[in-house]
Interface confidence: low
């Protein structure tokens, strides 16, 4: 079955700092969205192998990628308090599959000691239920996507 492993569950960074979020996917995959959850979920990036990544204006110039779409590490730089939130990986496949989420806490230097990450993945209010399909960006159907060559056949 298709699944997305996402790590870490929680990370704390100072204002101006950086965080890494890793999305690992098994099975057939067309691409990866990183979405910031909340009342109005926002797409942060879309990444697809051999494709120019799309980055939300708010994060342009602050995002780096390493790895490939099935094992992608997204680095967010120059963090601001407004970047605090839960970020989830969304695998674009026949159906939409979500990672467990990463809670990113961006703190002022003086309040760093007040914040702790537990070992458990974010749940409940920290990780809203993935938005309904109608709230998702329209995605091409599988039949509309080019057939992807196997990894060994990739140039």
């Amino acid at each position: 079955a298709q699944e997305v492993q996402q790590s870490p569950h929680c990370t704390i960074a100072p204002v101006g700092g950086s965080v890494n979020i890793t999305c690992s996917t098994s099975g057939e995959l067309h691409g990866i969205y990183l979405r910031q959850l909340g009342p109005q979920p926002q797409n942060i990036i879309y990444y697809e192998d051999r494709v120019v990544p799309t980055t939300d204006k708010r994060f342009q110039g602050r995002i780096d990628f390493s790895g490939s779409q099935d094992n992608l590490t997204i680095t967010m730089h120059h963090l601001q308090p407004s970047d605090t939130g839960t970020y989830t990986c969304q695998a674009v496949t026949e159906i939409n599959v979500y990672g467990s989420g990463t809670l990113v806490l961006v703190t002022e230097e003086q309040s760093q000691g007040l914040h702790r990450c537990s070992d458990a993945p974010p749940t409940g209010s920290a990780l809203p239920v993935p938005p309904t399909t109608s709230a998702l960006p329209a995605l091409p159907t599988a039949s509309a996507l080019p057939a992807l060559p196997t990894a060994s056949a990739l140039p």
């Epitope: 691409g31 797409n43 879309y46 697809e48 051999r50 494709v51 120019v52 990544p53 799309t54 780096d64 990628f65 390493s66 960006p137 329209a138 995605l139 091409p140 996507l145 080019p146 057939a147 992807l148 060559p149 056949a153 990739l154 140039p155």
Partner: antibody, heavy 129, light 107 residues
Framework: EVQLVESGGGLVKPGGSLRLSCAAS????????MSWVRQAPGKGLEWVGR??????????DYAAPVKGRFIISRDDSIKALYLQMNSLKTEDTAVYYC????????????????????WGQGTTVTVSS | DIQMTQSPSSLSASVGDRVAITCRTS??????LNWYQQKPGKAPKPLIY???SLQSGVPSRFSGSGSGTDFTLTISTLHPEDFATYYC?????????FGGGTKVEIK
């Protein structure tokens, strides 16, 4: 306007060297894979090689006839692509085009659409004694 | 390397004709195939990507079909500006390879 402009072509003797440049504008050059394609007089198109974007390792691939003689490089800070041609042969005579790699695909939040490959106007390289 | 066999190498047609150009590959490339149009002294112009998707700004009289090893570029109604040379290209594996071209001439 999305544009690629090649320069550096000219007449060179067999065994000589030449460096072609390609200046990009109007698009995010640093995230593009870039290729060189050539066309000998009266002949078809021949892929020369390509360079990936830095986030994909910036690695290069070459066609067999030029491997070991040609070197593709890029300078993202000035949106420039280069083709260093060494040990030139008469059969390297051609118009050389700089292009965005045809695998380059832009996506937005609502759809997935391919940006039309961008091609320069070409620069002519003549290898003759 | 993947070999690209384009046919015919040239054809004569009249304005208003329907024209079909075929491209056969030496191995399965799924739909990783592009079509280009080139006029004398000009750079190639992308027409079709992923075998059947029309590039932005290309007239709808151009269409592409096929998958696997057999592909076709069709011009439903030939216009005067369509007289040119057409190339297919596979982007499935390195080295990227082009077909030999099909020159569409005025009858």
């Amino acid at each position: 306007e999305v544009q690629l402009v090649e320069s550096g072509g000219g007449l060179v003797k067999p065994g000589g060297s030449l460096r072609l440049s390609c200046a990009a504008s109007g698009f995010s050059f640093s995230v593009a894979w870039m290729s060189w394609v050539r066309q000998a007089p009266g002949k078809g198109l021949e892929w020369v090689g390509r360079i990936k974007r830095k986030t994909d390792g910036g690695t290069t691939d070459y066609a067999a006839p030029v491997k070991g003689r040609f070197i593709i490089s890029r300078d993202d800070s000035i949106k420039a692509l280069y083709l260093q041609m060494n040990s030139l042969k008469t059969e390297d005579t051609a118009v050389y085009y700089c292009t965005t790699d045809p695998l380059l695909r832009y996506s937005d939040w609502l759809s997935h659409s391919l940006m039309g490959d961008v091609w320069g106007q070409g620069t002519t390289v003549t290898v003759s004694s | 390397d993947i070999q690209m066999t384009q046919s015919p190498s040239s054809l004569s047609a009249s304005v208003g004709d329907r024209v079909a150009i075929t491209c056969r590959t030496s191995q399965n490339i799924n739909n990783y195939l592009n079509w280009y149009q080139q006029k004398p002294g000009k750079a190639p112009k992308p027409l079709i990507y992923a075998a059947s998707s029309l590039q932005s700004g290309v007239p709808s009289r151009f269409s592409g079909s096929g998958s696997g090893t057999d592909f076709t570029l069709t011009i439903s109604t030939l216009h005067p500006e369509d007289f040119a040379t057409y190339y297919c290209q596979q982007t499935y594996s390195i080295p990227l390879t082009f077909g030999g071209g099909t020159k569409v001439e005025i009858k």
